[in-house]
């Protein structure tokens, strides 16, 4: 969590932003809160980016201001118009890119002062795993699989009975290459797994973190995966 | 060359189904947002279905749970299978390609006719 | 539900008259996210005007976008005998996820 304050002591005012990660080929949110004000008129949000020469969007006066914005964020840029009157400048970007990772600025002028805060925006991609029982396999075996992943995470195995268990020499991962030469698809393979147990298949990379889980009994088999964003720190 | 040429539809029956390609040449399908667009005879323009470069997928109410939209990566090629298919589905169906820039590249179209 | 309405429905003028055409949308709309295209009798739409109002590559300067919040407009300086077709506003992020407008048709007077 990043607070900003403004430069002019009785003339400031408070801008927090999260730092936040955006997965590519995805829209993604730049968050970003002010103390309000209560005439939309007399707010100006803008966002910028280190490194950039123009800015990544304005909005002054109740509207956008694009006039300024810089070329590789047209099209692409959009505030909460209807949330801007409650303090929320938060940033939606169109179609998320590697290249927009980077420093942020929110920067915030009202009728009580000025005020910004900085944001650290990480780009990469990551989803949900799904652990599947592999009926070609000569041996029990489980295979778990993630379409889109970047950059190379690591994989790691682990089991409900064998807590603490290291899997890495009866488990193989490989990393394929995607279309569009950005991600990767993820498969994890597990061997000599035993029924009526529960494994975990956990990928991880500096943005995100997923798990899938599956248990294997002689009746049934239950599935489940969840995914946590490691980067959102709050200034 | 930068296009989209889409293939697939034809005369079916209500209830029927159909599965429209569109195949891409010039730029990758899985990193941009790629768009279906239907337009009914005399009509105009309609949204049914958008795939993000992640593979998240949306609908317009209106196909809701009747249509799947797809794509091959490695053939560059974009889908839409149409099941359950009502008269109220005749139309010519575009893909388009939405890139950071709007609706920027279309396909001819495809006609689709729902019809006994 | 965000709704687009076009006006006027149809515009009847003449060659090297100006053309100014409406799209209002029933809730805010970014002005980054609406989006003017040009459809005439049997073709695909192509895209004119995209962030409000930025033309796309390779349409002449006749054609302008201006707007934001829930009022755009398309402005045409002077008609020429090619830009007679129907013209359609679109807008991208809200719910449904893309929207146009019904269309407003550019007839020759």
């Known amino acids: 969590l990043i607070i900003g304050f403004g430069i002019s002591g009785r003339h400031s005012i408070t801008v927090t932003t999260v730092a936040s990660a955006g997965n590519i080929g995805e829209d993604g949110i730049l968050s970003c809160t002010f103390e309000p004000d209560i005439k939309l008129s007399d707010i100006v949000i803008q966002w910028l980016k280190e490194g950039v020469l123009g800015l990544v969007h304005e909005f002054k006066e109740g509207k956008d201001e694009l006039s300024e914005q810089d070329e590789m964020f047209r099209g692409r840029t959009a505030v909460f118009a209807d949330q801007v009157i409650v303090g929320n400048a938060s940033l939606r970007l169109k179609n998320v890119q590697l290249t927009d990772a980077g420093t942020y600025k929110c920067y915030i002028i009202t009728s009580k002062g000025k005020g910004n805060a900085n944001l650290e925006y990480k780009t990469g991609a990551f989803s949900m795993p799904e652990v599947n029982v592999d009926y070609n396999a000569s041996s029990e075996t489980l295979r778990c699989e993630a379409p889109r992943w970047f950059p190379q995470p690591t994989v790691v195995w682990a089991s409900q009975v064998d807590q603490g268990a290291n899997f890495s020499e009866v488990s193989n991962t490989s990393f394929e290459l995607n279309s569009e030469n950005v991600t990767m698809k993820v498969v994890s393979v597990l061997y000599n797994v035993t029924i009526n147990n529960t494994y975990s298949c956990m990928i991880e990379n500096d943005i995100a973190k997923a798990t899938g889980d599956i248990k294997v009994t002689e009746s049934e088999i239950k599935r489940r995966s969840h995914l946590q964003l490691l980067n959102s720190k709050a200034s | 060359e930068v296009q989209l040429v889409e293939s697939g539809g034809g005369l079916i029956q209500p209830g029927g189904s159909l599965r429209l390609s569109c195949a891409a040449s010039g730029f990758i399908v899985s990193r941009n947002y790629m768009n279906w667009v239907r337009q009914a005879p005399g009509k105009g323009l309609e949204w049914v279905s958008v795939?993000?470069?992640?593979?998240?997928?949306y609908y317009a109410d209106s196909v809701k749970g009747r249509f799947t939209i797809s794509r091959d990566n490695s053939k560059n090629t974009l889908y839409l299978q149409m099941n359950s298919l009502r008269a109220e589905d005749t139309a010519v169906y575009y893909c388009?390609?939405?890139?950071?820039?709007?609706?920027?590249?279309w396909g001819q179209g495809t006609t689709v006719t729902v019809s006994s | 539900e965000i709704v687009l309405t076009q006006s006027p429905g149809t515009l009847s003028l003449s060659p090297g008259e100006r053309a100014t055409l409406s799209c209002r949308a029933s809730q805010s709309v970014s002005s980054s996210y609406l989006a003017w295209y040009q459809q005439k009798p049997g073709q695909a739409p192509r895209l004119l005007i995209y962030g409000a109002s930025s033309r796309a590559t390779g349409i002449p300067d006749r054609f302008s976008g201006s707007g934001s919040g829930t009022d755009f407009t398309l402005t045409i300086s002077r008609l020429e005998p090619e830009d007679f077709a129907v013209y359609y506003c679109q807008q991208y992020g809200s719910s449904p996820l893309y929207t146009f407008g019904q269309g407003t048709k550019l007839e020759i007077k």
């Open positions: 795939i993000y470069g992640s593979g998240r997928t």
């Open positions: 388009a390609r939405d890139g950071d820039y709007g609706m920027d590249v």
